[in-house]
């Protein structure tokens, strides 16, 4: 199947991806076309835009040329200037600022906690199955199978540290070689990037916001996929990661030291352990073929236990099973021996919600999955709302300048590397790349950070998570120290190699272009985002897993033709865009294929048909929520929530007016402006920090 043309161009003409739109009017209250060169992308930035989405009110303005949808929007400052405020207004403004900061930190805290609970939920739902993936003996001989197992397990348990720790314990127990573990680690790296992609889906309401957020999140995915695409064959051929890490491990005489510091967990753990606590050892035990673990619950019941070593008389089937001949006897009926038995005495139960419910793991997992996704979504909406109200005018300018501006010439190239270090440092502090990249996603969405700047931050995050793993390895007990350190180093050098491949030379920054391409498609066809998620993180790995189980001949038999078609399509696409004259007229575009094979339009029609019946109730629900939100925020009565979004979209699209999907992330002031209701906000409602 040929690729859809939208994939080819990361920065296409918006007429390509704006349904029914040929031009667009940027929302600029002062009607100026002033540009702002604070951005390292060196593209014009209009003072204010919500591209390519619109307020539901038609803005009568002269048609102008469409701006680049990847430009950062200038968040309009609708507040009174500080100098124009009276003393009471200033005090109120300060308190309002402090209140917003507290709220922001609060929602950020619950956002991180919900990510932790989400990981626990995934482990409860798919942890045991994930553990069983590891017990497949073919991993040793098939690196591709190892890779997809790494992806699937990490996706199922929503934690690369869990899958990595399983691999470490398996290597330490000689159930797995370091060579066989490397592809699993690569897969775990891919799997961990799903979290921020899920977070990006929460911003689906606003097309332009979603475009940026989704591209910002998937830049991580593409970096990992492309790194694996190049480095896995290199590793299989040369075993460079294994060799380099072995040399490092053998050249140092490590002593296992202190535990790796738990920085963010110190704050989040007291809350998350009231929700649920898991016995992570169960998944590892299943991975190691421990039959008894299959019937154990992952939900931890006893938090305080006393383990006592005692000598006990135990029966054995024959003398051969005796501890030693002198420690064996018969009572005439059975043969007995004396063994050291660890007797575990339960002292105190855990203090989480599910401790006394005795629900099956799947039920607890589903409950937590729903709750954590709702909390995650709610927190994200509130974070975006608060940031939207705080990051206006001069504040936004200062922040955007700080984050997105390069160092002066000739040190501009250093900016990205500093961003990598910042990303690594921040990830080390929060002890999770998922948390860091997920926190980054809404900031990209609302336009605080460009994708070009988010990319090195994400790469740094990948490095940060491996330094955490190295520290954890150094703190591990003697029997697992070598293997855990070697695997952590493999992870580290894999990410370093990936950065060297896809960052230093701007031309090689393919993940940015690919992510922008995907962002454009997903903004136009929002269902494609979920489709992408399912295909890349579930279907492809599961298919490869299935084919690998069938054996090499089947895998090669199916894989080679598929890879050949993909290469053929890519080459054709490259020739179509670079030198179409080389190709015969028929191959200069994809029109020779049926429409469904080179465009998403027919697919969109099919999906719309299926999702149609669900849009009305969903819309009504959205309207109710929106009304509540409007009441809380003090929106006018004529807030667009009062009319069902579906009717609005259909009606306005019929008139050729592009519509902005009803979304709770909107700037209230813009809505008022659009409805001709702009009034000077009194000091009670609106406030600007500078």
């Amino acid at each position: 199947m040929a690729p859809w043309p939208e994939l080819g161009d990361a920065q296409p003409n918006p007429s390509k991806y704006l349904e029914g739109a040929t031009s667009q009017q940027p929302i600029t209250p002062d009607k100026s076309k002033e540009t702002n060169k604070t951005d390292n992308t060196e593209v014009p930035v209009t003072k204010f835009e919500l591209l390519p989405t619109y307020s539901t009110a038609t803005l009568i303005e002269e048609p102008t040329e469409v701006d680049d949808p990847w430009n950062l929007p200038t968040l309009q400052d609708s507040g009174i200037k500080w100098s124009e405020r009276d003393a009471k207004g200033k005090i109120l403004c300060v308190f309002q600022g402090i209140g917003r900061l507290i709220l922001l930190l609060g929602f950020l805290y619950f956002f991180v906690c919900s990510l932790d609970v989400l990981s626990s939920a995934f482990q409860l739902v798919g942890g045991k199955m994930a553990g069983q993936f590891f017990s497949n003996s073919s991993i040793m001989s098939n690196p591709l199978l190892g890779l997809v197992i790494g992806v699937l397990v990490t996706v199922f348990v929503q934690s690369s540290s869990t899958s990595t720790s399983i691999v470490v314990s398996m290597v330490a127990s000689s159930l797995l070689t370091v060579r066989a573990a490397i592809p699993i680690i690569m897969g775990a790296n891919i799997g961990t990037s799903i979290t921020n992609t899920i977070v990006a889906l929460m911003q689906v309401g606003d097309r332009s916001e979603f475009r940026r957020a989704f591209a910002g999140a998937t830049v991580h995915d593409f970096f990992n996929w492309l790194s694996v695409l190049v480095l896995l064959p290199v590793e299989v051929a040369t075993h460079y990661l294994e060799v380099v890490t072995q040399l490092i491990v053998e050249s140092f005489h490590f002593k296992n030291g202190e535990d790796a510091p738990d920085l963010l967990k110190v704050i989040t753990k007291p809350f998350t352990k009231l929700i649920v606590q898991l016995d992570k050892k169960v998944i590892s035990q299943i991975a190691m073929n421990d039959e008894t673990a299959k019937n154990k619950s992952l939900v931890k019941i006893w938090c305080k236990t006393f383990t006592n070593m005692t000598q006990m008389n135990v029966t054995v089937p024959s003398m051969a099973n005796c501890t030693s001949p002198s420690l064996c006897w018969t009572d005439g009926i059975q043969i007995w021996t004396m063994k050291n038995v660890t007797y575990k005495e339960n002292i105190a139960k855990c203090q989480h919600i599910f401790v006394n419910f005795h629900l099956p793991d799947l039920a607890v997992g589903i409950i937590l999955l729903i709750i954590s996704l709702l909390v995650l979504c709610g927190c994200l909406i509130m974070i975006v709302k608060i940031l939207g109200s705080v990051l206006k005018g001069q504040v936004a300018t200062v922040i955007k300048k700080t984050i997105n501006t390069d160092f002066p010439f000739p040190f501009a190239w250093l900016t990205g590397y500093l961003a990598i270090l910042v990303g690594a440092g921040m990830t080390f502090i929060v002890q999770s790349s998922s948390v860091f990249t997920s926190a980054l996603t809404p900031l990209i969405g609302i336009g605080v950070i460009t994708i070009e700047r988010a990319y090195p931050l994400t790469l740094g995050s990948n490095i940060g998570t491996t330094t955490t793993a190295i520290l954890a390895a150094l703190a591990s007990p003697g029997n697992t120290l070598r293997s855990s350190l070697q695997i952590a180093l493999c992870h580290f050098f894999f990410n370093i190699s990936g950065i060297l491949l896809w960052y230093p030379i701007p031309f090689t920054r393919l993940p940015i272009r690919m992510a922008k391409g995907l962002g454009n498609i997903s903004a136009k066809y929002r269902w494609f985002a979920i489709f992408y998620l399912i295909i890349f993180f579930f279907l492809i790995p599961l298919t490869v897993f299935g084919l690998s189980l069938a054996g090499w001949p089947v895998l090669v038999g199916v894989g080679v033709p598929v890879v050949f078609i993909i290469i053929l399509v890519l080459c054709l696409r490259l020739l179509q865009s670079r030198c179409p004259r080389v190709l015969p007229k028929k191959l200069q575009n994809w029109n020779f294929l049926p429409l469904c094979m080179h465009s998403l339009k027919p697919w969109d029609a099919v999906i719309s048909k299926f999702t149609g019946p669900f849009q009305m109730p969903c819309c009504c629900c959205c309207r109710v929520c929106c009304r509540v939100c409007c009441l809380l925020c003090g929106c006018p009565k004529c807030c667009r929530c009062s009319k069902c979004c579906q009717d609005l979209e259909e009606g306005q699209e019929a008139q050729g007016v592009p519509v902005k999907a009803p979304e709770t992330f909107d700037n209230i002031t813009i809505s008022r402006e659009a409805q001709g209701e702009v009034r000077a906000p009194d000091s009670k409602t609106e406030c600007t920090a500078l």
């Epitope: 002198s326 064996c328 009572d331 005439g332 007995w336």
Partner: antibody, heavy 121, light 107 residues
Amino acid sequence: QVQLQQPGAEVVKPGASVKMSCKASGYTFTSYIIHWVKQAPGQGLEWIGAIYPGNGDTSYSQRFKGKAKLTADKSSSTAYMQLNSLTSEDSVVYYCARGNNYGSPAWFGYWGQGTLVTVSA
Amino acid sequence: DIVLTQSPVTLSVTPGDRVSLSCRASQSIGNFLYWYQQKSHESPRLLIKYASQSMSGIPSRFSGSGSGTDFTLSISRVETEDFGMYFCQQSNSWPVTFGAGTKLELK
């Protein structure tokens, strides 16, 4: 005091079966293993098997599997040994002896007086 | 099965003599060895448990020693009531086995 009472003699026909008893007293019958030992006149001792009255577990020496069957009646604190297909070679003394608790090494602190089985036509 | 070999088969002594009866195991049995005395027309009586521990009510002239494969029952001063058969028994390995016995007789 601990006592194990056995009938002094049993006379049986060749090919027939005999069920001899061993009545225990002076201790908790279900807590200790009862062993059966064979002794030919002027010969050594040979272990036949054992039964744990607490749960009815039994164990037999390879030589006596199918030949001997051990049972216990908790209500009367009596252990039984049934010998099948008797021949003249089975005309020996059979002792019951109290072993130790379940799981403790087997040694016999208390013995019955023994039952002399005579196989004759 | 573990084979216990007792020697001598017969031991002729006079009262007041010191005697040693030997029991050798075909493989190591730790200290799971017991000594029994059986007088004519009587049931066996346990003398020594765990190779060296005397049972209560047993005269102090009886003592046991050894571990592994070689065991000895010693009678410091033989008295007339001590004559009879002496058997050793092991419970280290299933099944329980007895030695063929040593006959202690009056010289």
